[in-house]
């Protein structure tokens, strides 16, 4: 379980890397509570006839995707970025958008967003991950360093139809998906419901009625009894794994 790994962090997420490393005193390791088991994601998406959809930022991708280079690491080849399948629970991440809906990037690991831990108005202990140089430390060495900041966080979850930015803004059972030119909370798809599997992503970024992803334990697959002449128009539904 994830209890077997101790996590340290010392970076404010989405900040550029430090120049010459960070300094500070070694931070204490934080044990992370175990989460629910999940399906692992692959290095590349493996849809039939999959054509990568180029992107510049996460918002151009689907709610269960993020924008990054498909090559190893984050460097990329020639700076080309495409929409990649989101990272499941307990996978390595570098920012929140990499994690699948219902998860967030905590100390480099996609963790479930268990909002029961944060009731409305509760004081939350937030870790500020510090990259500042500390001249008392060994010069140039980077050490995990943590500073605690107390802040008041209000967690109000968007109901169906509420405007949202990402799925974590929506209540349980909802995801944040495009509707016309904004994004609203829509229901996560149930077994048997029609889903969208993008074989050609050319119009994906301009999809104005975006469906949610399939719910837990379901995958978007071609409906077995749905045979049509055109491959591109075959119906996909949410089916049990």
């Amino acid at each position: 379980t994830l209890n077997s790994v101790l996590i340290n962090s010392n970076a404010i997420k989405n900040l550029p890397p430090p120049l010459g490393g960070a300094g500070g005193q070694p931070g204490s390791a934080v044990s992370v509570a175990p989460g629910v088991l999940y399906e692992g994601g692959n290095k590349y998406q493996t849809l039939d006839n999959y054509q990568p959809y180029p992107c510049a930022e996460d918002e151009e991708c689907g709610s269960d995707e993020y924008c990054s280079s498909p090559s190893r690491g984050a460097a990329g080849v020639g700076g080309v970025q495409i929409c990649l399948a989101c990272r499941k629970r307990r996978k390595r991440c570098m920012r929140h958008a990499m994690c699948c809906p219902g998860n967030y990037c905590k100390n480099g690991i996609c963790m479930p967003s268990d909002h029961s831990h944060f009731p409305r108005g509760e004081i939350e202990e937030s870790i500020i991950e510090n990259l500042g140089n500390d001249h008392n430390a060994a010069a140039g060495d980077g050490y995990p360093r943590r500073t605690t900041l107390t802040s008041k966080i209000y967690h109000t979850k968007g109901q169906e139809g509420s405007v949202c930015l990402r799925s974590s803004d929506c209540a349980a059972g909802l995801c944040c998906a495009r509707h016309f030119w904004s994004k609203i909370c829509k229901p996560v798809l149930k077994e048997g419901q029609v889903c969208t599997k993008h074989k050609r992503k050319g119009s994906h970024g301009l999809e104005i009625f975006q469906r949610c992803y399939c719910g837990e334990g379901l995958a978007c697959r071609i409906q077995k009894d749905h045979h049509q002449a055109s491959n591109s128009s075959r119906l996909h539904t949410c089916q049990r794994h």
């Epitope: 994830l2 690491g73 460097a75």
Partner: antibody, heavy 119, light 107 residues
Framework: QVQLVQSGAEVKKPGASVKVSCKAS????????ISWVRQATGLGLEWMGW????????GYAQNFQGRVTMTWNTSISTVYMELSSLRSEDTAVYYC????????????WGRGTTVTVSS | DIQMTQSPSSLSASVGDRVTITCQAS??????LNWYQQKPGKAPKLLIY???NLETGVPSRFSGSGSGTDFTFTISSLQPEDIATYYC?????????FGQGTRLEIK
């Protein structure tokens, strides 16, 4: 070319600490995790943990709880693994490996640093 | 922790033989599995990632398959330079764990 160069062999007494370095070249150092894996003579591979020099994230396997510290120096593209309170069973070859954080494949390895713990 | 069990622990085969190594996970790990080759006195080398994808520059005689808990690594036609120990590694859950290794020898 893409490579990880590790520091030389070490002989330590029980209770002491050892600090192994791993210098990266030929790739963007901050775009990958660096994992540390050890291998005792004639035995299998044991993952110790990772660190990401860009974010500073580190994760340690619980077997090494409280004994391992992974640090880095971005300016010289080097990561360090320090293991304290050494015991005889820590005698092993310690490898650093470039690790993709998408599929956690360790595709570039250092040659290994032999650490011998003996009184 | 997820336990990875490889079998056999060692095997002897002739040049040109088809060689198969299996790896079993103690729980479902989807396709989150890599295979490595380690020659004596050397560092491991990544051969297969995501259970079945061949790493760049690795000869096509190496292949991998499987998902869930049961995985197979195959060398379609054994070559003298394939003498090594082979390890599977799961990355579905932390900590990362390796199989105990399979030592391959030439008959």
């Amino acid at each position: 070319q893409v490579q990880l160069v590790q520091s030389g062999a070490e002989v330590k007494k029980p209770g002491a600490s050892v600090k192994v370095s791993c210098k990266a070249s030929g790739f963007t150092f901050t775009s990958y995790d660096i994992s540390w894996v050890r291998q005792a003579t004639g035995l299998g591979l044991e993952w110790m943990g990772w660190m990401n020099p860009s974010s500073g994230y580190t994760g340690y396997a619980q077997n090494f709880q409280g004994r391992v510290t992974m640090t880095w120096n971005t300016s010289i593209s080097t990561v360090y693994m320090e293991l304290s309170s050494l015991r005889s069973e820590d005698t092993a070859v310690y490898y650093c490996a470039r690790t993709d954080y998408y599929y956690y494949g360790m595709d570039v390895w250092g040659r290994g640093t032999t650490v011998t713990v003996s009184s | 922790d997820i336990q990875m069990t490889q079998s056999p622990s060692s095997l002897s085969a002739s040049v040109g033989d088809r060689v198969t190594i299996t790896c079993q996970a103690s729980q479902d790990i989807s396709k989150d599995l890599n295979w490595y080759q380690q020659k004596p006195g050397k560092a491991p080398k990544l051969l297969i990632y995501d259970a079945s994808n061949l790493e760049t520059g690795v000869p096509s005689r190496f292949s991998g398959s499987g998902s869930g808990t049961d995985f197979t690594f195959t060398i379609s036609s054994l070559q003298p330079e394939d003498i090594a120990t082979y390890y599977c590694q799961q990355y579905d859950d932390l900590p990362i764990t390796f199989g105990q290794g399979t030592r391959l020898e030439i008959k």
